[in-house]
């Protein structure tokens, strides 16, 4: 039986509103909550796309409006739709479109062919894409201030590009309770907003903000050391797209330095923690006298997964560790702001050459076995260590 | 898989001084010492030194202390010896191989160097 | 520094003969690590940590020994076996080699 209804349903997840004239808006299809694929064709009262209209249509993987009215795209229409990767608008009267109307979509194609596109530099993203190849975008016709059918680039004299961000920090080292200024300048055509991220820096600082486009101020208060390594990032944007730009507060504080017990990985190794801004300086002693590496007693850091934060982790690696190497083994850790020294006693192996005149003297009576081998004196684990 | 690269041969004159290259692929170039190692005509193995890429730490065997000079470019993975005055005694085949856990447990081809006027 | 002391300096075996090469530390050290190496070519790893085989190594070799002794068994000697084999100790600066063993097949 043939459909009368305004929508039709096309398969288990389609549907078709083809009936000229008879929608002015998207919102609340019935039955839309598993749509994946939306056709609208012949709607001129259709005219704005806003991102309450797509509102439960989390599904939708293919929208098509086509030979309808629609004049206006909101740039955040799609907000409700992350998984659309099919857009077609062509043939309607769209004179521009937001570079973040698809912002954040894994669009496969756009086709905009038959609108009534007006060339600058709102739409400098699209010939970028165009010109790229990027993602099937099918535009036909870009007007420039006027009909025409070919794409037309916009003139060698017009500068379309996104603001530019720099970020102002201080030139004098910063040290723990300091309270520190940063000013974000923008430059650009055409600004629209522009903003700090500092969802890094919970807890390191207190944050106060201030100022407006082109320039942003923030004062971070009372610092503390837990500011190191941490994003500071200032964005701005403008017709053309979005900046930002990422600073790091480097906070210094002393050194300090943490042992544990030697531990056998693949070899053996005296785990460290080291901390302090600037990155301490390290040194090694064996019973009190400098330490000398070499490639079988030697300083090996942990690749560290996290990278927000100053201290590192390590290894002092001794590869063929014998009784000689037995004793106490400190570790010094240095930076302008302080020192630290932390100590650990190592035992790998007995002397096998010590002799205790008190201890009884083993006689054997039987033949000494020719096949009998030695054992490693230091037994030692095959499994990869990390580092 | 690993492979430590030397150039074939250098030819130098006496008193003049010598750059061997040894060129790291198919591993973490800084997570491994280089050692150098040559070895004279009919001769046994000699130690000469070896760096850790990672922070630059050098040791020297004592007899070349003064003549030797080990370098590294991370950028491109390679390793340098310098040997300076050179005599007829220096012709050698001189051998880079690598260490992290156990010893030398991949060696270059070697780089042949004769000193003759 | 640390002598490593060969012996023999030269030796012969007939295919399946047992072979023993020995290496003497002049001072203690933890572990001994042997090389091959045939003419012309690069030394190759073969045996480290005193007794354990690198990879590829063929089980009829075996190390063995402590302190200031070690050495290098071979179970049953094969054509493949003749070469130069040296000993080396990672214990000391400057790191040393011994003279090497040369293993020729009778």
């Known amino acids: 039986a043939s459909c009368r209804e305004v929508c039709c349903p096309v398969g288990p997840s389609g549907l078709r509103c083809t009936r000229a004239g008879s929608l002015d808006t998207l919102r609340g299809l019935r039955g839309a909550g598993n749509l994946t694929e939306l056709y609208v064709e012949n709607q001129q009262h259709l005219q704005r796309l806003e991102f309450e209209d797509l509102q439960g249509l989390g599904e939708l993987r293919s929208l098509t409006i086509v030979k309808s009215g629609l004049r206006f795209v909101a740039p955040d229409a799609f907000r409700f739709t992350p998984r659309l990767s099919h857009l077609n608008l062509s043939s309607n009267a769209l004179e521009s479109l937001s570079w973040k109307t698809v912002q954040g979509l894994s669009l496969q194609d756009l086709t905009l062919s038959g609108n009534p596109l007006h060339c600058s530099c709102a739409l400098f993203w699209l010939q970028r894409w165009e010109q790229e190849g990027l993602c099937g975008v099918h535009t036909q016709t870009l007007h420039d201030s006027g009909p025409g059918d070919q794409f037309l680039p916009l003139g060698h004299n017009t500068s379309c590009g996104v603001p530019t961000v720099k970020i102002q920090m201080p030139n004098d080292s910063v040290e723990v309770g300091d309270d520190v200024f940063l000013q974000c300048q923008v430059e650009g055509l055409a600004l629209q907003q522009a903003d700090w991220i500092l969802t890094e820096l919970e807890g390191a600082a207190t944050v106060k903000k201030f100022g407006d486009l082109p320039s942003l101020g923030l004062i971070l208060v009372n610092v503390t050391s837990d500011l190191n390594k941490k994003n500071v990032t200032c964005w701005a944007e403008n017709d053309v797209g979005r900046a930002e730009v990422s600073v790091q507060v480097s906070v210094s504080f002393p050194a300090s330095v943490h042992l544990g017990l030697a531990v056998e990985q693949h070899h053996w190794c005296i785990p460290f923690s080291v901390d302090g801004q600037p990155a301490p300086s390290l040194r090694w002693l064996f019973n009190g006298s400098v330490l000398n590496e070499t490639s079988f007693i030697f300083t090996q850091f942990l690749e560290s997964a996290l990278t927000n934060e100053t201290m590192r982790h390590g290894c002092l690696r001794l590869n063929q560790p014998t009784h000689v190497n037995n004793g106490n083994y400190t570790l010094l850790a240095a930076n302008p702001y302080g020192q630290a020294a932390a100590s650990v006693m190592a035992a790998f192996m007995d002397n096998p050459f010590e002799f205790n005149p008190e201890d009884p003297i083993p006689v054997s009576f039987s033949p000494v076995d020719g096949n009998s081998t030695s054992r490693d004196p230091v037994e030692k684990k095959d499994e990869t260590p990390f580092g | 898989q690993v492979q430590l690269q030397q150039p074939g041969a250098e030819l130098v004159k006496p008193g003049a001084s010598v750059k061997l290259s040894c060129k790291s692929s198919g591993y973490t170039f800084t997570n491994y010492w280089m050692h150098w190692v040559r070895q004279r005509p009919g001769q046994g193995l000699e130690w000469i030194g070896e760096?850790?890429?990672?922070?630059?730490?050098?040791n020297y065997n004592e007899k070349f202390k003064n003549r030797a000079t080990l370098t590294v470019d991370i950028s491109s993975s390679t390793a340098y010896m310098q040997l300076s005055s050179l005599t007829s005694e220096d012709s050698a085949v001189y051998y880079c191989?690598?260490?992290?856990?156990?010893?030398?447990?991949?060696w270059g081809q070697g780089t042949s160097v004769t000193v003759s006027s | 520094q640390v002598v490593l002391t060969q012996s023999p300096a030269i030796m012969s075996a007939s295919p399946g003969e047992k072979v023993t090469m020995t290496c003497s530390a002049s001072s203690s050290v933890g572990y001994m690590h042997w090389y091959q190496q045939k003419s012309g070519t690069s030394p190759k790893r073969w045996i480290y940590d005193t007794s354990k085989l690198a990879s590829g190594v063929p089980t009829r070799f075996s190390g063995s020994g402590s302190g200031t002794s070690y050495s290098l068994t071979i179970s049953s000697m094969e054509a493949e076996d003749a070469a130069t084999y040296f000993c080396?100790?990672?214990?000391?600066?400057?790191?040393?080699f011994g003279s090497g063993t040369r293993l020729e097949i009778k």
């Open positions: 080396q100790q990672w214990s000391s600066i400057p790191l040393t």
């Open positions: 760096i850790y890429p990672n922070n630059g730490r050098v």
């Open positions: 191989a690598r260490s992290r856990y156990d010893p030398m447990e991949d």
